[in-house]
């Protein structure tokens, strides 16, 4: 066959779906690779063709669209499974072509099993809730397009293994789950099971997400530098190792980039000739407030180094702060015999 623009296997779109549930999968060509949509392609006389390679096989084969009850079907640029089976796992290819044009992309589809606590190999989206912030909601994800608005599905919510009912601060409200006041104890996996009828059949959609309760913007502050501070003086003799920790606390801020850096005499360590190393460690509180420690280390400090200005800087979306370390050269203690001799006026 003639040349085809092959975008290869799009592993960025590792699609996971649950066994025995409907799945609608859009051809990635129109989402990520081509500058036109399916309608434009269709009206220009292009045809969308689907085929697949089974798991652990090399042979590409056409998808069987003649299964009982139309278990697999195509509608515009969507491949439908009603429902999936475990052995549907494999690499799927959608190809757009006519006599003069051809473009195709493959993507992996994994059909996974879940247990009765909704545990599975599925990668879970994370939804962050602010601690003690008033009413917040999560919505049952990725259910759009499965049934028309005229259908009234049933929705059951679970936390871990348990159906949510009579929970103190968590209230199921259809597709939404409301948290009256989010607490650390609300951390966990939440599952919605959506059940709906279609053409005389009944289908379930199971969606699990992880809820993480994080620091509230109401309590957020600019970075706080705990070290260096005015109480600690780094007093060294030439030849000793100089270690100065910079420890900074950052309040949790959604999508904020937290940064810590040292300057030596106003320059970044990379821009000066001193043999300096910086090691960073990061720890998080239960509400994802962050503590970053950057330890500045000079193995054999010189008297010149001890005269320099060492400043720790920190920045977040809440602001920027800086603090200088107090560094000085240790004055060598006079030798004991000399001191005594001087005291007695000896020559």
């Amino acid at each position: 066959s003639e040349r085809c623009d092959d975008w290869g296997l799009d592993t960025m779109r590792q699609i996971q779906v649950f066994e025995d549930e409907p799945a609608r999968i859009k051809c990635p060509l129109f989402e990520h690779f081509l500058k036109f949509n399916y309608s434009t392609a269709h009206s220009a006389g292009l045809t969308l063709i689907w085929y697949w390679t089974r798991q652990d096989r090399d042979l590409e084969e056409p998808i069987n669209f003649r299964l009982p009850e139309n278990r697999i079907s195509k509608e515009k640029d969507v491949l439908w499974f009603r429902p999936t089976l475990l052995n549907d796992t494999g690499n799927y290819t959608c190809m757009l072509r006519n006599t003069t044009y051809c473009s195709k992309v493959a993507f992996p589809l994994e059909v996974v099993q879940k247990d009765s606590c909704f545990n599975s190999p599925m990668k879970l989206p994370v939804h962050k809730l602010y601690i003690e912030y008033g009413i917040q909601r999560i919505t049952c994800p990725n259910v759009d397009g499965y049934f028309p608005s005229s259908v009234k599905p049933t929705i059951t919510w679970y936390m871990g293994c348990y159906k949510i009912q009579n929970f103190n601060n968590v209230i199921p409200e259809g597709m939404n789950l409301s948290f009256l006041i989010a607490l650390i104890s609300n951390n966990g996996n939440y599952t919605c099971v959506v059940t709906y009828p279609e053409n005389g059949r009944t289908f379930h959609l199971t969606r699990t997400l992880t809820v993480k309760v994080v620091g509230s913007p109401k309590n957020a502050v600019p970075p706080v530098i705990h070290s260096p501070n005015d109480h600690v003086v780094y007093e060294k003799e030439p030849g000793e190792e100089l270690l100065i920790p910079c420890t900074v606390y950052f309040s949790f801020l959604m999508d904020s980039r937290n940064e810590v850096w040292w300057t030596i005499d106003g320059k970044k360590p990379d821009d000066i000739t001193i043999d300096v190393t910086i090691n960073e460690s990061i720890s998080h509180s239960r509400t994802e407030d962050e503590t970053r420690t950057q330890i500045l280390s000079i193995k054999k400090v010189t008297s010149e180094d001890l005269k320099r200005s060492y400043v720790c800087h920190a920045r977040s979306a809440k602001g920027e702060v800086a603090k200088a370390a107090k560094v000085k050269q240790k004055v060598p203690a006079p030798r004991y015999t000399v001191e005594l001799a001087c005291g007695f006026g000896a020559t």
Partner: antibody, heavy 117, light 107 residues
Framework: QVKLHQSGAELAKPGASVKMSCKAS????????IHWVKQRPGQGLEWIGY????????EYNQKFTDKATLSADKSSSTAYMQLSSLTSEDSAVYYC??????????WGQGTLVTVSA | NIVMTQSPKSMSMSVGERVTLSCKAS??????VSWFQQKPDQSPKLLIY???NRYTGVPDRFTGSGSATDFTLTISTVQAEDLADYHC?????????FGGGTKLEIK
């Protein structure tokens, strides 16, 4: 296809115990909760409780907490219900039911328990 | 516990007639009501879930409606094979509870 096959009828004396089984086939046993429902002759249905085979957790109707014990054996895809200290009030048909998303969609054929001196 | 009350206890209808069965909950159960059909010497079968959704394979002569505390199962044109007991149940909050049932007889 999904099937729940329940053990045969039981005739028991007052004060005795019985343990009935519900063997699942046609699906992954570990993926669904199993509920138990009681039906006295000519009467309505009564929910006893459920067992979650993954966690082993069972939730009971308070009325049955001292009467029924629910369990499951994943290796044989079988759910069990034990009834203790039997009285004539326990004479009934007992059903196991597979549930998902609040749908009591698949029922066993029932186990008849008769308590008689 | 939520009490589910069904009415009437029994009714006798002719083939082709319209049948309306009632189920009332003692508290608001939203849409979390299911209807079950139980033919003589058989297990119950799910007919309706979520108050109004027909389960797989259920003929469209069966229609569920209602919300909160008042629910109805309607058989638009009753057939001889519809002879059965009909149970409603709330699947809203533990303990799940069922009505006493309505026995439908065919004249």
């Amino acid at each position: 296809q999904v099937k729940l096959h329940q053990s045969g009828a039981e005739l028991a004396k007052p004060g005795a115990s019985v343990k009935m089984s519900c063997k699942a086939s046609g699906y992954t046993f570990n993926s669904y909760w199993i509920h138990w429902v009681k039906q006295r002759p000519g009467q309505g249905l009564e929910w006893i409780g459920y067992n979650n085979p993954t966690s082993g957790y069972s939730e009971y109707n308070q009325k049955f907490t001292d009467k029924a014990t629910l369990s499951a054996d994943k290796s044989s895809s079988t759910a069990y219900m034990q009834l203790s200290s039997l009285t004539s009030e326990d004479s009934a048909v007992y059903y196991c039911v597979r549930e998902y998303g609040d749908l009591f969609a698949y029922w066993g054929q029932g186990t008849l328990v008769t308590v008689s001196a | 516990n939520i009490v589910m009350t069904q009415s009437p206890k029994s009714m006798s209808m002719s083939v082709g007639e319209r049948v309306t069965l009632s189920c009332k909950a003692s508290e608001n159960v939203g849409y979390s009501v299911s209807w079950f059909q139980q033919k003589p010497d058989q297990s119950p079968k799910l007919l309706i879930y979520g108050a109004s959704n027909r389960y797989t394979g259920v003929p469209d002569r069966f229609t569920g409606s209602g919300s909160a505390t008042d629910f109805t199962l309607t058989i638009s044109t009753v057939q001889a094979e519809d002879l059965a007991d009909y149970h409603c149940g709330q699947i809203y909050i533990y303990p799940y509870t069922f009505g006493g049932g309505t026995k439908l007889e065919i004249k």
